[in-house]
Interface confidence: low
């Protein structure tokens, strides 16, 4: 598996992973104690015919072309967790690993 | 985790799993010995704000709204394999489990 990495200066129009820093304070998410910011990344771009298709299924649906199928879209294909310190609903401080917070790779599915 | 199941008569416009039978013979994929047809399913529909979002990350990117982020799209969130009998590139007959051939659930990511 592989995926493209881009930045805001890239001419790449295909599906690519772009850098994005999420700032919890800027969102007003004051129940998160740490981290206040983290590198989340995001996926954006076109999914050309068979480009970066994660599954053979994606290609088969493209071939079958059923009503309403929009073609593959650029979406996270590998994600990783981050450790966070936060208040839960009962105002208790929790330290835990929150899954799927960082995009490691993007692909077409 | 849950996802919606629809059929061609559904009025559901949100992200949903639809039935799709893939016919390898119709595609001219003559290297596949068995099955000749299988139920693959596919995902289609709108991804409204926070509807069926698989990852918290999806919501965070929506909040941050970086340049070029297209919003979540309806894509497989759970897939399963099928067993297939096929010729490989060396014309040898192979029996194997091919991953991610069937969509079991759709969601927004």
């Amino acid at each position: 598996d592989f995926g493209l990495d881009c930045d805001e200066h890239s001419t790449e129009s295909r599906c690519c992973r772009y850098p994005l820093t999420v700032d919890f304070e800027a969102f007003g998410w004051d129940w998160i104690i740490a981290p206040k910011r983290y590198k989340a990344n995001y996926c954006s771009g076109e999914c050309e015919f068979v480009f970066l298709q994660k599954y053979p299924h994606t290609h088969l649906v493209h071939q079958a072309n059923p009503r309403g199928s929009a073609g593959p879209c650029c979406t996270p294909t590998k994600m990783s967790p981050i450790n966070m310190l936060y208040f839960n609903g009962k105002e208790q401080i929790i330290y835990g690993k929150i899954p799927a917070m960082v995009v490691d790779r993007c692909g077409c599915s | 985790d849950f996802g919606l199941d629809c059929d061609e008569h559904s009025t559901e416009s949100r992200c949903c799993r639809y039935p799709l039978t893939v016919d390898f013979e119709a595609f001219g994929w003559d290297w596949i010995i068995a099955p000749k047809r299988y139920k693959a399913n596919y995902c289609s529909g709108e991804c409204e704000f926070v509807f069926l979002q698989k990852y918290p990350h999806t919501h965070l990117v929506h909040q941050a709204n970086p340049r070029g982020s297209a919003g979540p799209c309806c894509t497989p969130t759970k897939m399963s394999p099928i067993n297939m009998l096929y010729f490989n590139g060396k014309e040898q007959i192979i029996y194997g489990k091919i991953p991610a051939m069937v969509v079991d659930r759709c969601g927004c990511s």
Epitope: F2, G3, L4, D5, C6, H9, S10, T11, E12, S13, R14, C16, E46, E48, F49, V50, F51, G71 | -
Partner: antibody, heavy 124, light 107 residues
Framework: QVQLVQSGAEVKKPGASVKVSCKAS????????MHWVRQAPGQGLEWMGN????????NYNQRFKARVTMTTDTSTSTAYMELRSLRSDDTAVYYC?????????????????WGQGTLVTVSS | DIQMTQSPSSLSASVGDRVTITCKAS??????LSWFQQKPGKAPKSLIY???RLVDGVPSKFSGSGSGTDFTLTISSLQPEDFATYYC?????????FGAGTKLEIK
């Protein structure tokens, strides 16, 4: 083999529009971006923009953005470039070119196939 | 926009000579540079991509080098069919921009 065949030469009056076609054959038309490049007589090459036939998404050079429209017809595997409000300095040979990807990194591509060019002459 | 400055604008050389054409970008373009050959009345032809990779079918007498802002195209042992105009192109950023060209003439 992969081929791009463009429409014939055109003579237009200032203020008119021209629509140049580029018919692709020998490959899956929807799978590759098509670019348009022009060349004024005795001058260098100038990139005008591109279009992705799969969904019609295009990127235009800011210099032409107000006057150019790139479209495709996937049923005939044809790309079109329309330039409006023509001026004498739009007199040029207009080329279509296929963008071919060879790698996995940003900008890992080159123009592997070009059309033969279409001469557009703008004259009163 | 990224400016591509190509030099020289014209060059006279003899059959068998080795020639070098340079292209300078106004900012770092990594290795995202292509070289083209164009003959009168014909469409351009890709020679080199990613600064130093040869397009399939192009003879090995053509070579490219450089990264960042400074790039060169070298043609070793010129043959009559090599006399043409050569262009560089940056494909690191939109809008794509070409050098002004180098016309290679027989001395």
């Amino acid at each position: 083999q992969v081929q791009l065949v463009q429409s014939g030469a055109e003579v237009k009056k200032p203020g008119a529009s021209v629509k140049v076609s580029c018919k692709a054959s020998g490959y899956t038309f929807t799978g590759y971006f098509m670019h348009w490049v022009r060349q004024a007589p005795g001058q260098g090459l100038e990139w005008m923009g591109n279009i992705y036939p799969y969904n019609g998404v295009s990127n235009y050079n800011q210099r032409f953005k107000a006057r150019v429209t790139m479209t495709t017809d996937t049923s005939t595997s044809t790309a079109y470039m329309e330039l409006r409000s023509l001026r004498s300095d739009d007199t040029a040979v207009y080329y279509c070119a296929r963008r071919y990807y060879y790698g996995t990194g940003p900008a890992d591509w080159y123009f592997d196939v070009w059309g033969q060019g279409t001469l557009v002459t703008v004259s009163s | 926009d990224i400016q591509m400055t190509q030099s020289p604008s014209s060059l006279s050389a003899s059959v068998g000579d080795r020639v070098t054409i340079t292209c300078k970008a106004s900012q770092d373009i990594n290795s995202y540079l292509s070289w083209f050959q164009q003959k009168p009345g014909k469409a351009p032809k890709s020679l080199i991509y990613r600064a130093n990779r040869l397009v399939d079918g192009v003879p090995s007498k053509f070579s490219g080098s450089g990264s960042g802002t400074d790039f060169t195209l070298t043609i070793s042992s010129l043959q009559p069919e090599d006399f043409a105009t050569y262009y560089c192109l940056q494909c690191d950023e939109f809008p794509l921009t070409f050098g002004a060209g180098t016309k290679l003439e027989i001395k």
